[in-house]
Interface confidence: medium
């Protein structure tokens, strides 16, 4: 799917829009809010009843080059006694983000936007039990 | 994830860093993944730390619709279906990259923007501070 052109009638294309070759778009990768402060809860990945670990994937031809992925530690959830309860399930929570992919074709370099699915953490759910007839 | 070796005959051998401004293809790779979390899973209802999903829409952004999670309870749901305040529901947050139209309203000119979204909630053991 192409990025939708704004179809709303109240959006008039301003004269100040930069000229862009057909089939492509101009992208400034100087990130807005690059230095915003994240106020995440403390150590939730280890205190959760569905704890998870983090791994960092690194790719020099991707921007940003580092993407952090979470993996649930258990199939079940941790109960009040600190034991795994397999009557409940730890499941991943995922979120899409955009990255810019650099592609080399011979001497030329092209750039492509890509949607990446990031596993952010895990939550504990009641399983869906299918009763077989 | 390895850089493809460049032909030594190529002019201006590529810098390891990305340029500040790039021209990118309008087609997005992997674009057809499901963007509505209500359709993709029912974890938000089945979790012991359930959450509501709120639609955040901004036509100057791509994607224009982002779903924000808000934990329903301060505590977590126990085996009896009641809220247990000895445990806490907390949001799991993630920084994501989106496209912001820049200059505003321009159809094919964007800038990357980092935004913080709450993706879901998880149940944690609280850190209890005993006040002296």
């Amino acid at each position: 799917r192409k990025i939708p052109k704004v179809g709303h009638t109240f959006f008039q294309k301003p004269e100040s829009c930069p000229p862009v070759p057909g089939g492509s778009m101009k992208l400034d990768i100087g990130i807005i809010n690059e230095n915003q402060r994240v106020s995440m809860s403390r150590n939730i990945e280890s205190r959760s009843t569905s704890p998870w670990n983090y791994t960092v994937t690194w790719d020099p031809n991707r921007y940003p080059s580092e993407v952090v992925q979470a993996q649930c530690r258990n199939l079940g959830c941790i109960n009040a006694q600190g034991k795994e309860d397999i009557s409940m399930n730890s499941v991943p929570i995922q979120q899409e983000t955009l990255v810019v992919r650099r592609k080399h074709q011979g001497c030329s370099v092209s750039f492509q936007l890509e949607k990446v699915l990031v596993t952010v953490g895990c939550t504990c759910v009641t399983p869906v039990i299918h009763h077989v007839q | 994830g390895i850089t493809i070796p460049r032909n030594p005959g190529c002019p201006n051998s590529e810098d390891k860093n990305f340029p500040r401004t790039v021209m990118v293809n309008l087609n997005i790779h992997n674009r057809n993944t499901n963007t509505n979390p209500k359709r993709s899973s029912d974890y938000y209802n089945r979790s012991t730390s359930p959450w509501n999903l709120h639609r955040n829409e901004d036509p100057e952004r791509y994607p224009s619709v982002i779903w924000e999670a808000k934990c329903r309870h301060l505590g977590c749901i126990n085996a009896d279906g009641n809220v247990d305040y000895h445990m806490n529901s907390v949001p799991i947050q993630q920084e994501i990259l989106v496209l912001r139209r820049e200059p505003p309203h321009c159809p094919n000119s964007f800038r990357l923007e980092k935004i913080l979204v709450s993706v879901g909630c998880t149940c944690v053991t609280p850190i209890v501070h005993h006040v002296a």
């Epitope: 106020s39 | 808000k70 907390v90």
Partner: nanobody, 123 residues
Framework: EVQLVESGGGLVQPGGSLRLSCAAS????????VGWFRQAPGKEREFIGA????????YYAVSEKDRFTISRDNSKNTLYLQMSSLRPEDTAVYYC????????????????WGQGTLVTVSS
């Protein structure tokens, strides 16, 4: 980053009512658990209650459950405390507080606090 500013305090007669407001700045207000504490002269800071980010879940200190009502309006980035049947012992500085986690907030260890607003109950 969240900044909190309380308002609505003042002098009220015993048996009267008062509504305190807490205006929050910051785009992510709705992802925070927010609540109220109070501190009477010469006493420890006391937890009144808290409300979840969505507003669906409210937890009160048992002693104030019937007279105090906590609510929030995320569209206005505002937290409220409606107090009724006020008594002289309700005289205190009332503080608005916010944190990602109820556990921290409940035990007075929130990340963000307002400056407080004084409520005086006297005839």
């Amino acid at each position: 980053e969240v900044q909190l500013v309380e308002s609505g305090g003042g002098l009220v007669q015993p048996g009267g009512s008062l509504r305190l407001s807490c205006a929050a700045s910051g785009r992510t207000f709705s992802s925070y658990v927010v609540g109220w504490f109070r501190q009477a002269p010469g006493k420890e800071r006391e937890f009144i209650g808290a409300i979840s980010g969505s507003g669906d879940s409210i937890y009160y200190a048992v002693s104030e459950k019937d007279r105090f009502t906590i609510s929030r309006d995320n569209s206005k980035n505002t937290l409220y405390l409606q107090m009724s049947s006020l008594r002289p012992e309700d005289t205190a500085v009332y503080y608005c507080t916010a944190d990602q986690e109820f556990g921290y907030l409940r035990f007075g260890r929130s990340e963000y606090w307002g400056q407080g607003t004084l409520v005086t109950v006297s005839s």
